[in-house]
């Protein structure tokens, strides 16, 4: 299974200090992964290469994303990317890419969280994306 | 074979101007790779995807890591990641990720070197890690 | 098929506001990919993991690279990496890595473009490289 996702939109709930991205498939091979709003549901357990990039346009001193999984009654951070940002708006433009190999369980929900309220993201599909490759 | 490693600790020898990371397996499939203190020993020769991320909290003007291999009487750089760092300690927070595909030989020792004495690293397992996927 | 490429040189045509990199193979397995000057020709259609890193030594406010494909009469951006750069030349040193999974067609030409005239790149093979893994 292979899945490459690109953004539909990004939102912060009113009382939340995080921003989440809603995803849609750009490339899909196999049935083992299912885009589901702000998350991706794992249908086939196994070892996956996961990758995530977010394009930030924000003067907040550091920006980044956390890729986490929720399943079997608990939430776990898999990996994160952190980028210090310039304070000048014209210069505050950075992509943050990270990736890793993890064992995912059937029913896990994977999500990308930016731990900032109303984070200023560029949702271009070549700047912000999320992907899975079953190994 | 698949191996995803996370840090145990990082040290600079007294007379050394580099910082090295000691690794432990977080995910392991197959017997082809063996964590060995500050290095990873290749048991099965072949073509591997290698990836490395280090999370820096350091105001030194540029930080980064070098992934190198030692084997058959030679040491060589495989790839490197470089990140310019802000001079203000509160802002100096950057992850540096890189990866590539390389032919590794039996007996090679792979290591991650930060070419700075006493580099200030964040050894969180979701911020600093090292991985191998046999292709 | 696997292909890891390193730079031969980088040039900007006189009237152009982009810099392109000419590539040579460092590791090659299979016949499905062919380095061809500033591009890589796809011989075998399929789903590929592509990765790209460029090492910048440039004080231009933001630097980065675009990985695009040309084929079937059109050009398409696959992914890009963006890095804000310090204004001081001694600090302006950043690698920019990105990667993703894409379906490539026979005859496609893949290239790495830096959308800056005469971009100051470090063409060390460990800092600037391009790779493909057929999944």
């Amino acid at each position: 299974s292979v899945l490459h996702l690109v953004p539909i939109n990004a939102t912060s709930k009113d009382d939340s200090d995080v921003t989440e991205v809603m995803w849609q498939p750009a490339l899909r091979r196999g049935r083992g992964l299912q885009a589901q709003g702000y998350g991706v549901r794992i249908q086939d357990a196994g070892v996956y290469l996961l990758y995530s990039q977010v394009l930030f346009q924000d003067v907040t001193f550091t920006m980044g994303q956390v890729v986490s999984r929720e399943g079997q009654g608990r939430q776990e951070t898999l990996f994160r990317c952190i980028r210090s940002m310039p304070s000048h708006p014209d210069r505050a433009y950075n992509s943050c890419y990270s990736a890793g190999v993890f064992h995912l369980h059937q029913g896990d929900i994977l999500s990308v969280i930016i731990p900032r309220a109303r984070a200023k993201l560029n949702l271009s599909p070549h700047g912000t994306f999320l992907g899975f490759v079953k190994l | 074979s698949v191996l995803h490693l996370v840090p145990i600790n990082a040290t600079s020898k007294d007379d050394s101007d580099v910082t090295e990371v000691m690794w432990q397996p977080a995910l392991r499939r197959g017997r082809g790779l063996q964590a060995q203190g500050y290095g990873v020993r290749i048991q099965d020769a072949g073509v591997y995807l290698l990836y490395s991320q280090v999370l820096f909290q350091d105001v030194t003007f540029t930080m980064g890591q070098v992934v190198s291999r030692e084997g058959q009487g030679r040491q060589e750089t495989l790839f490197r990641c470089i990140r310019s760092m802000p001079s203000h300690p509160d802002r100096a927070y950057n992850s540096c990720y890189s990866a590539g595909v390389f032919h590794l030989h039996q007996g090679d020792i792979l290591s991650v070197i930060i070419p700075r004495a006493r580099a200030k690293l964040n050894l969180s397992p979701h911020g600093t890690f090292l991985g191998f996927v046999k292709l | 098929s696997v292909l890891h490429l390193v730079p031969i040189n980088a040039t900007s045509k006189d009237d152009s506001d982009v810099t392109e990199v000419m590539w040579q193979p460092a590791l090659r397995r299979g016949r499905g990919l062919q380095a061809q000057g500033y591009g890589v020709r796809i011989q075998d259609a399929g789903v590929y993991l592509l990765y790209s890193q460029v090492l910048f030594q440039d004080v231009t406010f933001t630097m980065g690279q675009v990985v695009s494909r040309e084929g079937q009469g059109r050009q398409e951006t696959l992914f890009r990496c963006i890095r804000s750069m310090p204004s001081h030349p001694d600090r302006a040193y950043n690698s920019c890595y990105s990667a993703g999974v894409f379906h490539l067609h026979q005859g496609d030409i893949l290239s790495v473009i830096i959308p800056r005239a005469r971009a100051k790149l470090n063409l060390s093979p460990h800092g600037t490289f391009l790779g493909f893994v057929k999944l």
């Epitope: - | 070098v66 009487g73 040491q75 007996g107 290591s111 | 460092a26 093979p125």
Partner: antibody, heavy 121, light 112 residues
């Protein structure tokens, strides 16, 4: 472009030590090993050893252990080789050479101009 | 140590002639990975050595195509198809497969 600039000629007394330098430019110093090679007068070439500046690791030809000590200073992109307890047998030209390690080969692709060491009382 | 023996010691040639230099190793210079790190270097009078050939037969960038390397195991050859004046000097073979790495004794290419 890649350059290796070696220090000037040395005239030293028997039993003394000498430290030769090799300043690198035009590439990332820590990414490539520096080899040292000896050429005695009218003779061929002998490999002394290498240092990898990225980690400080070294590999010596057993013949030169105790005679040669290789070091590297990353801040100045300079490799050094100290020769100790000098005798007339150590009179030679010493070369530093960068070893490349990509595009499928290893080889000493760039060389310094050499430093002449003469041991004489 | 691997002993590298070059023949001849001296090779007088006329400009435009072909020249051939042999290098024989005391044991195989194939390393445990299956790679043969056999190189050829040219040292012109008063200069540093220059890399000509790596991994038996691959020309280094900028080296004219009149230079070619061949061989395997313990027997290697460097050929110059048409000798030019700038080719004069001492040619060394070198093995980087087994530590300590070793050079041949050299072959001096000179004008007849």
């Amino acid at each position: 472009q890649v350059q290796l600039q070696q220090s000037g000629p040395e005239l030293v007394k028997p039993g003394a030590s000498v430290k030769l330098s090799c300043k690198a430019a035009g590439y990332i110093f820590t990414d490539y090993t520096i080899n040292w090679v000896k050429q005695s007068p009218g003779q061929g070439l002998e490999w002394i050893g290498w240092i990898y500046p990225g980690s400080g690791n070294r590999k010596y030809n057993d013949k030169f252990k105790g005679k040669a000590t290789m070091t590297a200073d990353k801040s100045s992109s300079t490799a050094y080789m100290q020769l100790s307890s000098l005798t007339s047998e150590d009179s030679a030209v010493y070369f530093c050479a960068r070893e490349s390690n990509y595009v499928g080969y290893y080889a000493m692709d760039y060389w310094g101009q050499g430093t002449s060491v003469t041991v004489s009382s | 140590d691997v002993l590298m023996t070059q023949t001849p010691l001296s090779l007088p040639v006329s400009l435009g002639d072909q020249a051939s230099i042999s290098c024989r190793s005391s044991q195989s210079v194939v390393n445990s990975n299956g790679n043969t790190y056999l190189e050829w270097y040219l040292q012109k009078p008063g200069q540093s050595p220059n890399l000509l050939i790596y991994k038996v037969s691959n020309r280094f960038s900028g080296v004219p195509d009149r230079f070619s390397g061949s061989g395997s195991g313990t027997d290697f050859t460097l050929k110059i198809s048409r000798v030019e004046a700038e080719d004069l000097g001492v040619y060394y073979c070198f093995q980087g497969s087994h530590v300590p790495w070793t050079f041949g004794g050299g072959t001096k290419l000179e004008i007849k």
